[in-house]
Interface confidence: low
């Protein structure tokens, strides 16, 4: 179920799958929610630790049991991912942090009259992920009212420093507030060039596009279909970026599909989940559990309810069925995508709906922390 | 909202505008989306307007002036006014609206979490009131959704300010001693929300106050935590399944 409780002065021991810098516990929780394996997180505010390297540290954690031992650590904040929390799931983060400088690659500097205007500029710039603004009272006069637009390899700051009269925040593109607008078109038989930022396996171009949309550095993508001439590249989804923000070139290429991230869409973003079920397809991955259920929809529901399950395969092979029930293979991988996709099988596959935000899960549930 | 500022898109995605379409169409009250098919508002919004077919509910909007005849709206399937509400009193100022069709959730249209039943222990320090209501006592409805940050005041303090009224435990008050920031006419039924542990909760429903934003006259809100049993009973009995965002 959905757990929204935050544990003050507590730190989860072990289970680390990733770490980054975030300005507060809520942003850390959001990163955990969108990380394919993260179930728990611990955050160290500046006041909680003397080690400058670990200040603002956000530690994403996984656990086979769904929990980890808590150790007392003054000032630390820990909590759960919101993966099963329905409409609470959002990559939108509006807060502005006063007295904090979020470091990254500064690619644009301009003078603006307010931090809100700086945030708006970041939101309306295709490459901007976060920003810092030097206020009217900043100690160095020449930097006052400077708006620095930034990005980083992981989409989070490379460091966060306490600095008076500086205010920082994130782009509001995930809030569907960008003025840029987006290209909804899918280009058949066209491959985009430029820099690959990630490679995943997906069953179709639409899943590829959604993954691109929620990847911090993906601006456009190329998907190689299951009939692509090179077998090892079939179902490969290449997430791409470029200096200009658009593909520098595109090549006509049979059995490829290309398109753009939808992060810059106005008013509506795709849900960060994939609800379609793919008949005759087998998703490979690490086995989490195998259970007998009646029908593929129940298999998907079972996967959704098991928080660590990322995708599933429902087998219809006679040896995998007992009366009306057949085997439901619950699976996971390092990046949340299948490690292989096989066609022509007797069964169906699909993804967990744990990140769908339309669910009627009890998204506001809280559990009192036991002592 | 008096002393407020413009909201931005998706900042308060649970806020809805309750409008009446007779010959002309007008915004009358606010409300809060609490489930795919449920809106929570104030009972007094229906004083003299109990007919559900005259109401139009707009969700996922920021600017009332953007509403045209083509703007989609929800219609009311059922109005459930608290059984103890009386037009002549301020008590039990709470009503549920069941929509004819469920709404999909988006960044601009999604529900607010409800508090735990009888929530008295939580100390809320970051509370906001939103609405399209008057920006001064003798004002007009605003086009852009307004927001204002207002501190909660204790019921004891509130009772001192309203000696002629009974401030019950089922009410919650919010305001500044010096006034200047408050809800006003047209904000009724809308949300008083507080952020706690990174999560927004619906603490109050805008109900009444002496004028608007007056010194030492806080706004009075229906305390949602006190009505959780009623909300759950009505939403469950209506279709056998709780459809709002409710804590366990």
């Amino acid at each position: 179920g959905c757990l929204t409780q935050l544990y003050e002065n507590a730190f989860f021991r072990g289970g680390d799958v990733a770490s980054m810098y975030t300005p507060n516990a809520q942003y850390c929780q959001m990163r955990c929610t969108f990380h394919p394996r993260c179930l728990l997180f611990s955050f160290l505010p500046a006041s909680s630790i003397n080690d400058m390297e670990k200040r603002f540290g956000c530690f994403l954690k996984d656990s086979v049991t769904g929990t980890l031992p808590k150790v007392h650590r003054t000032g630390a904040v820990s909590g759960h991912s919101l993966k099963q929390c329905g409409h609470q799931i959002s990559a939108c983060h509006r807060d502005i942090y006063k007295g904090v400088d979020m470091r990254g690659v500064n690619f644009n500097v301009s003078k603006v009259s307010s931090v809100e205007e700086c945030q708006k500029r970041c939101t309306s710039n295709i490459r901007c992920q976060f920003f810092s603004y030097a206020t009217q009272t900043f100690h160095k006069a020449e930097y006052r009212n400077n708006c620095l637009l930034k990005y980083s390899p992981g989409g989070t700051p490379t460091a966060i420093k306490v600095l008076s009269n500086v205010e920082s925040g994130f782009s509001l593109k995930p809030c569907a507030l960008s003025e840029i607008g987006c290209h909804m078109n899918i280009f058949q038989h066209l491959a985009f060039s430029d820099v690959d930022v990630a490679r995943v396996l997906t069953p179709d171009a639409f899943v590829c596009r959604t993954i691109c949309t929620y990847h911090p550095n993906c601006l456009f993508f190329t998907f190689y279909t299951n009939v692509w001439k090179i077998e090892s590249q079939r179902n490969v989804c290449l997430l791409k970026t470029s200096e200009s923000g658009t593909p520098s070139s595109s090549t006509p290429q049979e059995n490829t599909i290309s398109g753009y991230s939808l992060l810059t869409c106005k008013r509506t973003l795709p849900e960060p989940c994939h609800s379609k079920i793919y008949p005759g397809v087998d998703f490979g991955g690490e086995e989490l559990n195998v259970t007998f259920v009646k029908g593929v929809n129940v298999c998907q529901e079972t996967c959704t309810k098991m928080i660590r399950c990322q995708f599933f395969t429902y087998s219809l092979l006679p040896e995998d069925c007992k009366e009306e029930k057949c085997k439901c293979f619950l699976r996971l991988s390092m990046d949340g995508s299948p490690t292989r996709i096989a066609y022509g099988t007797q069964g169906s596959s699909g993804y967990s709906l744990r990140l769908c935000n339309t669910g009627d899960n009890s998204v506001c549930t809280t559990k009192t922390s036991t002592r | 909202i008096v002393g407020g500022t413009n909201s931005s898109w998706g900042e308060w995605p649970w806020q809805v505008s309750l409008q009446v379409k007779l010959t002309a169409q007008r915004h009358l009250c606010g409300g809060s989306l609490i489930g795919h098919q449920w809106v929570l508002t104030a009972a007094h919004c229906f004083d003299g307007l109990p007919l559900q077919d005259v109401w139009r509910i707009y969700s996922g909007i920021l600017n009332l002036s953007d509403i045209t005849k083509d703007t989609p709206f929800s219609q009311i399937k059922e109005i459930i006014i608290h059984q103890n509400y009386k037009v002549s009193e301020g008590n039990h100022d709470i009503a549920l609206i069941k929509l004819q069709a469920p709404l999909n959730y988006t960044e601009f249209q999604k529900p607010i979490c409800l508090p735990s039943k009888g929530d008295t222990s939580t100390i809320y320090t970051n509370c906001w009131v939103t609405g399209w209501g008057f920006s001064k006592e003798k004002g007009e409805i605003q086009n852009i959704l307004q927001k204002v940050n207002i501190p909660l005041v204790t019921n004891e303090e509130c009772q001192k300010r309203y000696q002629d009224y009974k401030i019950t435990q089922r009410m919650v008050c919010a305001g500044y001693k010096e006034g200047g920031k408050d809800a006003c006419k047209g904000d009724s039924g809308g949300p008083l929300v507080c952020k706690h542990n990174g999560m927004w909760r619906l603490v109050g429903i805008t109900s009444w106050g002496e004028g608007c934003a007056r010194r030492e006259q806080p706004g009075v809100y229906t305390k949602v935590a006190e009505y959780m049993d009623w909300i759950l009973e009505k939403t469950q009995s209506s279709d056998g399944k709780a459809q709002m965002q409710s804590p366990a």
């Epitope: - | 002309a24 007008r26 003299g48 002549s88 008057f134 006592e137 409805i141 106050g209």
Partner: antibody
């Protein structure tokens, strides 16, 4: 500027009928409970009738119940008082009124029209 | 029905005087009482509502007090512009006016 302008008054015989109008401007008419109040020559004020914002609820003083009908047209920003079976004691200046800031919801009247004179005499 | 009784019906006073008008309700109306001023040939003007709340723009020499059934309107220092008729009005259950108090020059 907020204004209420009554019209329709005049001389009418006992048992006759008259329809008063009150044209509102400068405010969102459909949001407010509207009232009719009258004042007989040299006498005090008497509340006559009230109508809620939608027109769905109407209330009357005992002295006019069954004879007078209050109504409104929100699209025309106009309040009406249909007076039937008029009597000599209905002779008065008739005012329409409303209160602008309606929270709490039981309120006094702070905006009045200039009034229209109704004389019932044979 | 709730009846409102004002006293006195006429009051003679001079500029600078402190003037008090009382209003009695036939049953408790809490603080749901308003005071109006009316000049000949004009519509009434709201002075005070909820027994003691001064309407915006009304001079502070006017004040109201009381609750339940007994109410008073006080003019702390009568000014030339204050010679008029004053009405109380209850709005606890519908609306009823007192019969009025005429304040005239002594």
């Amino acid at each position: 500027e907020v204004q209420l302008l009554e019209s329709g008054g005049g001389l009418v015989q006992p048992g006759g009928s008259l329809r008063l109008s009150c044209a509102a401007s400068g405010f969102t008419f459909s949001h407010y409970i509207m009232m009719w109040v009258r004042q007989a020559p040299g006498k005090g004020l008497e509340w006559v009738s009230g109508i809620y914002s939608s027109g769905g609820i109407t209330v009357y003083a005992d002295s006019v119940k069954g004879r007078f009908t209050i109504s409104r047209d929100n699209s025309k920003n106009t309040l009406y008082l249909q007076m039937n079976s008029l009597r000599a004691e209905d002779t008065a200046v008739y005012y329409c009124a409303y209160r602008r800031s309606g929270v709490p919801r039981r309120d006094a009247f702070d905006i009045w029209g200039q009034g229209t004179m109704v004389t019932v005499s044979s | 029905d709730i009846q409102m009784t004002q006293s006195p019906s006429t009051l003679s006073a001079s500029v600078g005087d402190r003037v008090t008008i009382t209003c009695r309700a036939s049953q408790s109306i809490s603080s749901w009482l308003a005071w109006y001023q009316q000049k000949p040939g004009k519509a009434p003007n709201l002075l005070i509502y909820k027994a003691s709340t001064l309407e915006s723009g009304v001079p502070s020499r006017f004040s109201g007090s009381g609750s339940g059934t007994e109410f008073t309107l006080t003019i702390s220092s009568l000014q030339p512009d204050d010679f008029a008729t004053y009405y109380c009005q209850q709005y606890n259950t519908y609306w009823t006016f007192g019969q009025g108090t005429k304040v005239e020059i002594k």
